[in-house]
Interface confidence: medium
């Protein structure tokens, strides 16, 4: 159920496992389900009471090169009259994903898995009120 | 990471594309960093479109545990704390990359897999279809 740290024996190795140098793993970056598409409700980023914009970040030494990040448009939330209500807060919702980072060291290249935090969208929350004594 | 020597013409032979298969270090960068304190939040309870979190477990995947959001209501919570069905709670979905053991059960051989997760919910104005 888990990926061990370096040096942990994980599964009894089936015969078909490829040989891998110690401290490393073989990673096929041909993505399974590559063509799967998100079937989110239409343009929820604009229809939300906590609307957001998208920014595409691009890095040629990262796989995938494109990562889309959301930013909340407002501090408050949009009320029924279409006005910003600052008694409520628009806050980002975040999710971790994995990327592969390519690193150049002189005339050599190495690859490292990296955990990246992606802001996916925003939600409207009641603020936490801190009462001053 | 595992260093791969480049060919002798190195400075001019930069390959812009990633190879199909790479050897990567077992240690994941940022594995245990709490990158943003806002991530560890109670938004799921305080949202006007609150959600529950369900544990999705798969021993052949890394990470093996993923928490999936499910919106609690069809509508949104209004100022009085009641569900308002003139608005809709909808899931915010995101494609994320995970590692899948390939071949199955192999200790150090993986393939990237794209999976769709519901991360949370947001309150939206419904799309009204006018009948002609």
């Amino acid at each position: 159920r888990k990926i061990p740290k370096v040096g942990h024996t994980f599964f009894q190795k089936p015969e078909s496992c490829p040989p891998v140098p110690g401290g490393s793993m073989k990673l096929d970056i041909g993505i399974i389900n590559e063509n799967q598409r998100v079937s989110m409700s239409r343009n929820i980023e604009s229809r939300s009471t906590s609307p957001w914009n998208y920014t595409v970040t691009w890095d040629p030494n990262r796989y995938p090169s494109e990562v889309v990040q959301a930013q909340c448009r407002n501090l408050g939330c949009i009320n029924a009259q279409g006005k910003e209500d600052i008694s409520m807060n628009s806050v980002p919702i975040q999710q971790e994903t994995l990327v592969v980072r390519r690193k150049h060291q002189g005339c050599s290249v190495s690859f490292q898995l990296e955990k990246v935090l992606v802001t996916v969208g925003c939600t409207c929350v009641t603020p936490v009120i801190h009462h001053v004594q | 990471g595992i260093t791969i020597p480049r060919n002798p013409g190195c400075p001019n032979s930069e390959d812009k594309n990633f190879p199909r298969t790479v050897m990567v270090n077992l240690n994941i960068h940022n594995r245990n960093t709490n990158t943003n304190p806002k991530r560890s939040s109670d938004y799921y309870n305080r949202s006007t479109s609150p959600w529950n979190l369900h544990r999705n477990e798969d021993p052949e995947r890394y990470p093996s545990v993923i928490w999936e959001a499910k919106c609690r209501h069809l509508g949104c919570i209004n100022a009085d704390g009641n569900v308002d069905y003139h608005m809709n709670s909808v899931p915010i979905q995101q494609e994320i990359l995970v590692l899948r053991r390939e071949p199955p059960h192999c200790p150090n051989s993986f393939r990237l897999e794209k999976i769709l997760v519901s991360v949370g919910c947001t309150c939206v104005t419904p799309i009204v279809h006018h009948v002609a």
Epitope: I3, K5, F10 | R39, S40, S41, R55, E57, W67
Partner: antibody, heavy 119, light 107 residues
Framework: QVQLQQSGAELVRPGASVKLSCKAS????????IHWVKQTPVHGLAWIGV????????AYNQKFKDKATLTADKSSSTAYMELSSLTSEDSAVYYC????????????WGQGTTLTVSS | SIVMTQTPKFLLVSAGDRVTITCKAS??????VAWYQHKPGQSPKLLIN???NRYTGVPDRFTGSGYGTDFTFTISTVQAEDLAIYFC?????????FGGGTKLEIK
């Protein structure tokens, strides 16, 4: 160093509820799951459920779904387990344990809380 | 749920003896098995994870092995301070389950 400090022994009446606590120190509380375990002389150790303090997510052993409610307070780095409609069957030692989500194993346990349900 | 059957329930040994405890899972749990030591009045301590991986700081007289359904925990040379209850746990899939424990007593 990592510590899970559990609340003291409880003696409660049948039908009542009790809230046990597990205070974490020595690490970032939001990063790792807290699991709860019940120990009785007759049935041994039984897994109750898990809470992820970072996202509030919970999952329960079906046997304890209507008995236990898991919560966490990030401001005090404390996980809680509330046990309701108590009977003598709930008399046990209850442990919290930390699960290293990315490394993938349980490492630290609390010292346990003894709950006695008796009239 | 997965049943972990641990044997024996009791062991009475002399210092210097070799001790073996087994845990049998009712279905394959790969090697997602941990072994713990529980001394009276203390928290349980992790000794072995991933069936055979000795946890940080654990003396090398404690070893574990196994894969699938059959797991073994060994203390190569028992010492007086090893008096405790030892138990296994599978965390392959929830609900996570435990062996019944083995009480180790020193003559």
């Amino acid at each position: 160093q990592v510590q899970l400090q559990q609340s003291g022994a409880e003696l409660v009446r049948p039908g009542a509820s009790v809230k046990l606590s597990c205070k974490a120190s020595g690490y970032t509380f939001s990063d790792y799951e807290i699991h709860w375990v019940k120990q009785t002389p007759v049935h041994g150790l039984a897994w109750i459920g898990v809470i992820h303090p970072g996202n509030g997510g919970t999952a329960y052993n079906q046997k304890f779904k209507d008995k236990a409610t898991l919560t966490a307070d990030k401001s005090s780095s404390t996980a809680y387990m509330e046990l309701s409609s108590l009977t003598s069957e709930d008399s046990a030692v209850y442990y919290c344990e930390r699960f290293l989500t990315y490394e993938g194993y349980f490492d630290y346990w609390g010292q346990g809380t003894t709950l006695t349900v008796s009239s | 749920s997965i049943v972990m059957t641990q044997t024996p329930k009791f062991l009475l040994v002399s210092a210097g003896d070799r001790v073996t405890i087994t845990c049998k899972a009712s279905q394959s749990v790969n090697n997602d098995v941990a072994w713990y030591q529980h001394k009276p009045g203390q928290s349980p301590k992790l000794l072995i994870n991933y069936a055979s991986n000795r946890y940080t700081g654990v003396p090398d007289r404690f070893t574990g092995s196994g894969y699938g359904t059959d797991f073994t925990f060994t203390i190569s040379t028992v010492q007086a301070e090893d008096l405790a209850i030892y138990f296994c746990q599978q965390d392959y899939g929830s609900p996570y389950t435990f062996g019944g424990g083995t009480k180790l007593e020193i003559k």
